[in-house]
């Protein structure tokens, strides 16, 4: 297989053993296309078709489609996190990728194979992704390996797991529009997070912090971890350079107010 040199950290989903696979429901009977569940899912679900709403944590778009926020979306990344993207034809968004950094080819066959059944990937004006299912047996993992733990999803009888024997999800992110040196430290952190973690679409929402940036790329006063279900995310106050300001935190029971702080 191809070398993964230069890929940076990769996420390796927890192996999907028979006990976990047994928790999958049989695949839906009527689907235009079947894809694996989002994240570290190994159960099958219906792919989203062109024009359907999508996001980082929703079902995957079908092959040949990408999940893209609407062009006039003020907060494109947030739109994808919230599932407010749309599945659009991949070729239609290729012109937006002029500034894409070269993405390394997937290990193994570079063409889309039967195993690559979740080709629908996530796009935004600030991040682009190339989604490949690669076999860890041919993918020398290096750097930080993150194991995604099983999550009981009893309502759908599914576990968030992956066939270790079959595939590992990696997500490659690159800057798309302007060079990141033109942005402030918050934007650079966001770009760095996306570029180096490479697995936004396989991470649980609480697993990564995407900083809250202003239009100039500096940190907004209030930073929060994502909420988990009904549980509010942990919030804190920072200056424009992202340095935490003492005495302004909350564990989610009450809101944190950063009124007197200046981040601009």
């Amino acid at each position: 297989g191809a070398s993964s040199a230069g890929l940076g950290p990769v996420v390796r989903c927890e192996p999907c053993d028979a006990r976990a696979l047994a928790q999958c429901a049989p695949p839906p009977a009527v689907c235009a296309e079947l894809v694996r569940e989002p994240g570290c899912g190994c159960c099958l679900t219906c792919a989203l078709s062109e024009g359907q709403p999508c996001g980082i944590y929703t079902e995957r778009c079908g092959s040949g489609l990408r999940c893209q926020p609407s062009p006039d979306e003020a907060r494109p990344l947030q739109a994808l996190l919230d599932g407010r993207g749309l599945c659009v034809n991949a070729s239609a968004v290729s012109r937006l990728r002029a500034y894409l950094l070269p993405a390394p080819p997937a290990p193994g066959n570079a063409s889309e194979s039967e195993e690559d059944r979740s080709a629908g990937s996530v796009e935004s004006p600030s991040v682009s992704s190339t989604h490949r299912v690669s076999d860890p047996k041919f993918h020398p993992l290096h750097s930080k390996i993150i194991i995604i733990k099983k999550g009981h999803a009893k309502d759908s009888q599914r576990y968030k797991v992956d066939y270790e024997s079959q595939s590992t999800d990696t997500q490659n992110f690159s800057s798309e529009s302007k060079r990141e040196t033109e942005y402030g430290p918050c934007r650079r952190e966001m770009e760095d997070t996306l570029n180096h973690l490479k697995f936004l679409n396989v991470l649980s929402p609480r697993g990564v912090h995407i900083p809250n940036c202003d239009k100039k790329g500096f940190y907004k006063k209030k930073q929060c971890r994502p909420s988990k279900g009904r549980k509010r995310g942990f919030c804190w106050c920072v200056d424009k350079y992202g340095q935490p300001l003492p005495g302004y935190t909350t564990k989610g029971k009450e809101d944190v107010h950063c009124y007197s702080m200046q981040s601009k």
């Epitope: 006990r19 696979l21 928790q23 999958c24 429901a25 049989p26 079947l34 059944r117 009893k154």
Partner: antibody, heavy 116, light 107 residues
């Protein structure tokens, strides 16, 4: 250890109904679905359908739709499969198995004979 | 429906032999294929899942390979307790379907 224990053999007349039970133990019943698979004497395996032990969702084989009903009783960790309007070609050993796409534990089987 | 075709339908082999059973799907099923062993009067037993993953407690002489439409179950060195019928099963689409079985008999 995980066990699926099925009810005893049944002899039924054509047109009648049969209800086979499958009592699960050794695991959290509601975390897994139960599938039903049958096997006519000397023949291969045929998937009949699946039921979620958590919410009762079902997925039946099209050829049995309308004749089969799968249910669960979470209070007793028991799954049931009822087959109506029995025909002679329904004579088979009926197995319950844990899981929806991979069947990692199986019951011992229940022989249902349909004969006039 | 996805039709699973197993071959051979039966084979005779001796203890210590290497045995290969093939299973072909009528359409691509990626790696969503499982193998079971069944002995007379007994329920099937899961051997291999996801085409190549060995189920816990199953001897390592059993192995599976393949993806797409063609799959293989291999017993590297046949043991007396391995004489049984073997079934493949696809879990890619509903209805889930099994192959017709391969009976491994003593030569």
């Amino acid at each position: 250890q995980v066990q699926l224990v099925q009810s005893g053999a049944e002899v039924k007349k054509p047109g009648a109904s049969v209800k086979v039970s499958c009592k699960a133990s050794g695991y959290t019943f509601t975390s897994y679905g139960i599938s039903w698979v049958r096997q006519a004497t000397g023949q291969g395996l045929e998937w009949m359908g699946w039921i979620s032990a958590y919410n009762g969702n079902t997925n039946y084989a099209q050829k049995l739709q309308g004749r089969v009903t799968m249910t669960t009783d979470t209070s007793t960790s028991t799954a049931y499969m009822e087959l109506r309007s029995l025909r002679s070609d329904d004579t088979a050993v009926y197995y319950c198995a844990r899981g929806g796409i991979v069947f990692d534990y199986w019951g011992q089987g229940t022989l249902v004979t349909v004969s006039s | 429906d996805v039709v699973m075709t197993q071959s051979p339908s039966s084979l005779s082999a001796s203890v210590g032999d290497r045995v290969t059973i093939t299973c072909r799907a009528s359409q691509s099923i990626s790696s969503y294929l499982n193998w079971y062993q069944q002995k007379p009067g007994k329920a099937p037993k899961l051997l291999i899942y996801a085409a190549s993953s060995l189920q816990s407690g199953v001897p390592s002489r059993f192995s599976g390979s393949g993806s797409g439409t063609d799959f293989t179950l291999t017993i590297s060195s046949l043991q007396p307790e391995d004489f049984a019928t073997y079934y493949c099963q696809q879990s890619y689409s509903t209805p889930l379907t099994f192959g017709g079985g391969t009976k491994v008999e003593i030569k």
